[in-house]
């Protein structure tokens, strides 16, 4: 709390300008009217206030708007946004994408703070879903944003928004998240032709089922090893040697370097050694010739 002291003669602020730049803490408190500050918030960002001075200005706004700031003030908070707590932000009702952009711009270069996370949460909840424009904005500022959402939250992403997603936005997504995003991507890109479709769907394939991988193997897509290594193990295991060869095309040679890593390792264990030998890569660990493979899971399902 700043003590209430009278404003010295001639120091009363008539507008928010740089004449306030070196005001002491108590002078700002005594000489700046909160209503004036609220109407001229946009000017604060042109003035290099210290953090201590910003604390005083925030205190003034808090007193003026105890139930939360109006959006007209929020949009022009600028660097004062960095002084807000998640509790402050939970009182806000932010509906304009322009307001969101303005505040994210202020935080640019910083990690996603609890304040920003709260702001985004309030904004998205207010909109009811993650529409394309919002997703565009959020991933532009925070490429990892999508992967910070739970599968439940991702389920509210409409397929149309998937067009805004760039490959790097999915870098930190885990299989559970890709399981949710892949069907949406498949729906979003369904009208594209083969090669264009593969370019768009490639970064989502960590959520693809076996039947979709089989279908891709018939389309000469030449999947790179980095993408193959991110596929679901359970989706890769049923693929035949011939299907993997078609899926990878010239990249099939890369299997040798990855033979000790999942899903390649597990896939090799499921293939006949004879079939693996046809690749000419020296892959070892397949089922020896003459052995009978019993699919126990199928047997259990039948009984």
């Amino acid at each position: 709390e700043v003590e209430k002291t009278a404003c010295p003669s001639g120091k009363k602020a008539r507008e928010i300008d740089e004449s306030l730049i070196f005001y002491k803490k108590w002078e700002l408190e005594a000489c700046v009217d909160a209503a004036l500050l609220a109407t001229q918030m946009d000017r604060v960002n042109a003035i290099p206030f210290t953090y201590e001075q910003l604390d005083v200005l925030k205190h003034k706004l808090d007193e003026l708007y105890p139930q939360g700031y109006p959006e007209s003030v929020i949009q022009h908070l600028g660097y004062l946004f960095l002084k807000m707590s998640p509790e402050d932000i939970r009182k806000w009702n932010v509906t304009s994408l322009e307001t969101l952009k303005a505040l994210l711009e202020v935080n640019k270069g910083h990690e996603m703070s609890p304040q920003v996370a709260t702001l985004i949460d309030r904004f998205v909840k207010g909109r009811g879903q993650l529409d394309k424009d919002t997703l565009d904005t959020l991933t532009a500022f925070y490429p990892g944003y999508l992967c910070s959402l739970s599968p439940e939250e991702l389920s509210s992403v409409p397929p149309s928004s998937i067009w805004a997603v760039r490959p790097q936005d999915l870098d930190t997504c885990d299989p559970r998240q890709l399981d949710v995003l892949y069907p949406k991507a498949r729906l979003a890109f369904q009208n594209m032709n083969g090669s264009e479709y593969f370019v768009k769907i490639q970064s989502f394939l960590g959520g693809a089922p076996t039947e979709d991988l089989k279908a891709l193997s018939q389309q000469n897509v030449s999947m790179d090893l980095a993408t193959f290594m991110k596929l679901r193990t359970d989706a890769v295991l049923p693929l035949t040697v011939a299907e993997v060869q078609k899926l990878l095309g010239p990249h099939v040679e890369g299997l040798k370097a990855e033979e000790r890593h999942r899903p390649v390792r597990d896939w090799i264990l499921r293939q006949r050694q004879d079939d693996l030998d046809t690749l000419g890569l020296g892959l070892q660990g397949g089922i020896p010739n003459g052995y009978l493979v019993l699919d126990l899971s199928m047997q259990e399902a039948l009984s």
């Epitope: 740089e18 004449s19 210290t50 001075q53």
Partner: antibody, heavy 119, light 106 residues
């Protein structure tokens, strides 16, 4: 090119005066508060004085208050420091520094000019 | 506000991880910057707002902390990193600098 270039340093006797200049280029000079920061030989940095973008507001460290005057001429993109009643302890390299538009850390510094106060 | 840097000097080898601390005499939120200064040169901004990397500064430099205790870390010391490092607070006037930490070759 964005740069600051100080001049006006030199040898002066105790009690004497000196006027430092700092020529700015490559940015909108009038939009930024500017500062003088000094560094005594072999010592750390000390913020000496600052001035707002228009020149209407100034600030001085207690060690120079009443003796130094900061000013600027935005038409010439130049910052000044008038130093009077100089003392031996004012001997230092004086740097002109530009702060960020909205804050008080310095993203652009001049090369510095040496002021030596000695009899 | 007084800023106390420690150590005042340290010897390290290329490739070493180096940590410099800056302690404020009272809380300054995240209003702290770090600078690098080489002999005969002006200081150069490395970190602002305690942890934000200035554009063009190598990612081996990082800052952390809030309130009164702050840290500058160089993850893998390079030959060009041997210099003196200063912290500066911009929470309130007068702006103040730490006493500096000289990083020398072992």
């Amino acid at each position: 090119e964005v740069q600051l270039l100080e001049s006006g340093g030199g040898l002066v006797q105790p009690g004497g005066s000196l006027r430092l200049s700092c020529a700015a280029s490559g940015f909108t000079f009038s939009s930024y508060a500017m500062s003088w920061v000094r560094q005594a030989p072999g010592k750390g940095l000390e913020w000496v004085s600052a001035i707002s973008g228009s020149g209407g507001s100034t600030y001085y460290a207690d060690s120079v208050k009443g003796r130094f005057t900061i000013s600027r001429d935005n038409s010439k993109n130049t910052l000044y420091l008038q130093m009077n009643s100089l003392r031996a302890e004012d001997t230092a390299v004086y740097y002109c520094a530009k702060g960020r538009r909205f804050s008080w850390y310095f993203d652009l510094w001049g090369r510095g000019t040496l002021v030596t106060v000695s009899s | 506000i007084q800023l106390t840097q420690s150590p005042s000097s340290l010897s390290a080898s290329v490739g070493d991880r180096v940590t410099i601390t800056c302690r404020a005499s009272q809380g300054i939120s995240s209003a702290l910057a770090w600078y690098q200064q080489k002999p005969g040169k002006a200081p150069k901004l490395l970190i602002y707002d305690a942890s934000s990397l200035e554009s063009g500064v190598p990612s081996r430099f990082s800052g952390s902390g809030s309130g009164t205790d702050f840290t500058l870390t160089i993850s893998s010391l390079q030959p060009e990193d041997f210099a003196t490092y200063y912290c500066q607070q911009f929470n309130n006037y007068p702006l103040t600098f730490g006493g500096g930490t000289k990083v020398e070759i072992k």
